[in-house]
């Protein structure tokens, strides 16, 4: 039985050209984590192997740092990056479990960002 | 095609070290895994370990720590696996294998599909 | 580390049978589970994984099921080429193999 929840940073906002930490923790359950996903849509940003650590996409290479964590850290951002982002985490003996981020990306310098989610 | 080629049999003397080589072609050889299992003579398989080829990441099975390192080498698609201190019982084929899953497929890394055929190792004094 | 036990260990069937192997993790793996077929002499094959994923270019006459710590590869209708060990291998940390089940011509 999936007992686990997972938290996130849910709705953030960021300044054009800035960056961004996506963030997501697993808890209320002891399920062991093996990968961890970060998708933007249906595209995939980087995974978190259990044993073989992060992998960038290529593609996103240059604007994708790992971490803090298990999150993920969006540079450079641009207007385009407005969207949803979704951790996924891939756990044994629970399954999949599956977290959102809304991101919006502002022109103006008054972007109001989101409180910053710290993993305890 | 996708293929693994591995360097030949070996024979070692006990407390000596082996190294064998696992040439990928036919594939992007940074965007999967590779694991070495091994099968000592009528016996069963045996995980190792594995390496990123992308970040050089690598996990060793607990009963090699200390004993085995694995590497690559990106600019020749190789894999390595060195293997220490030889004893009688490291007798066995030594096989390396490509994960199944691409590290952008976004599926769980774990299963392998691509096999090298093979390298005996012996181990005799 | 979590233990994979296979069973049989070996078994004789004839060509045509409906041949049924199990696999127990000694803990819960979800379906973090693939089966291998190997020949004498040769590297091991993939022919499922995820537990009931069928690999490209594997005949479909191969079935997986099961979940959680119980696990079943079947052959629907043995063929003479299928005469071979089998091996279950668990893809949670750190990846173990089953004893394998030796499937021999009655």
């Known amino acids: 039985m999936m007992t686990g929840t997972i938290e996130t940073t849910g709705n953030i906002s960021a300044e054009k050209g800035g960056s961004i930490i996506l963030q997501c923790h697993l808890s209320s359950t002891t399920a062991q984590v093996t990968q961890v996903n970060w998708e933007q849509q249906d595209q995939l940003l980087a995974i978190c192997n259990a044993d073989l650590g992060w992998h960038i996409s290529p593609s996103f290479k240059d604007r994708v740092a790992p971490g803090p964590g298990l999150g993920l850290t969006l540079q450079s951002l641009t207007v385009n990056d407005t969207g949803e982002y979704f951790c996924i985490y891939h756990t044994y003996p629970d399954g999949t479990y599956t977290g959102r981020i809304f991101l919006e990306v502002l022109e103006s310098s008054v972007a109001e960002h989101g409180a910053r989610f710290q993993i305890p | 095609q996708v293929q693994l080629v591995q360097s030949g049999a070996e024979v070692k003397k006990p407390g000596a070290s082996v190294k064998v080589s696992c040439k990928a072609s036919g594939y992007t050889f940074t965007s999967y895994p590779i694991g070495w299992v091994r099968q000592a003579p009528g016996q069963g398989l045996e995980w190792m370990g594995w390496i990123s080829s992308y970040n050089g990441n690598t996990n060793y099975a607990q009963k090699l720590q200390g004993r085995v390192t694995m590497t690559t080498d990106t600019s020749t698609s190789t894999a390595y696996m060195e293997l220490r201190s030889l004893r009688s019982d490291d007798t066995a084929v030594y096989y390396c294998?490509?994960?199944?899953?691409?590290?952008?497929?976004?599926?769980?890394?774990?299963?392998?599909?691509?096999w090298g055929q093979g390298t005996m190792v012996t181990v005799s004094s | 580390d979590i233990q994979m036990t296979q069973s049989p260990s070996s078994l004789s069937a004839s060509v045509g049978d409906r041949v049924t192997i199990t696999c127990r993790a000694s803990?819960?793996?979800?379906?973090?589970l693939n089966w291998y077929q190997q020949k004498p002499g040769k590297a091991p094959k993939l022919l499922i994984y995820a537990a009931s994923s069928l690999q490209s270019g594997v005949p479909s006459r191969f079935s997986g099921s099961g979940s959680g710590t119980d696990f079943t590869l079947t052959i629907s209708s043995l063929q003479p080429e299928d005469f071979a060990t089998y091996y279950c291998?668990?893809?949670?940390?750190?990846?173990?193999f089953g004893g394998g089940t030796k499937v021999e011509i009655k």
């Open positions: 803990q819960s793996i979800s379906s973090y």
């Open positions: 291998q668990q893809s949670v940390p750190p990846r173990t």
């Open positions: 294998a490509r994960g199944a899953s691409s590290f952008w497929s976004g599926d769980v890394l774990g299963a392998f599909d691509i």
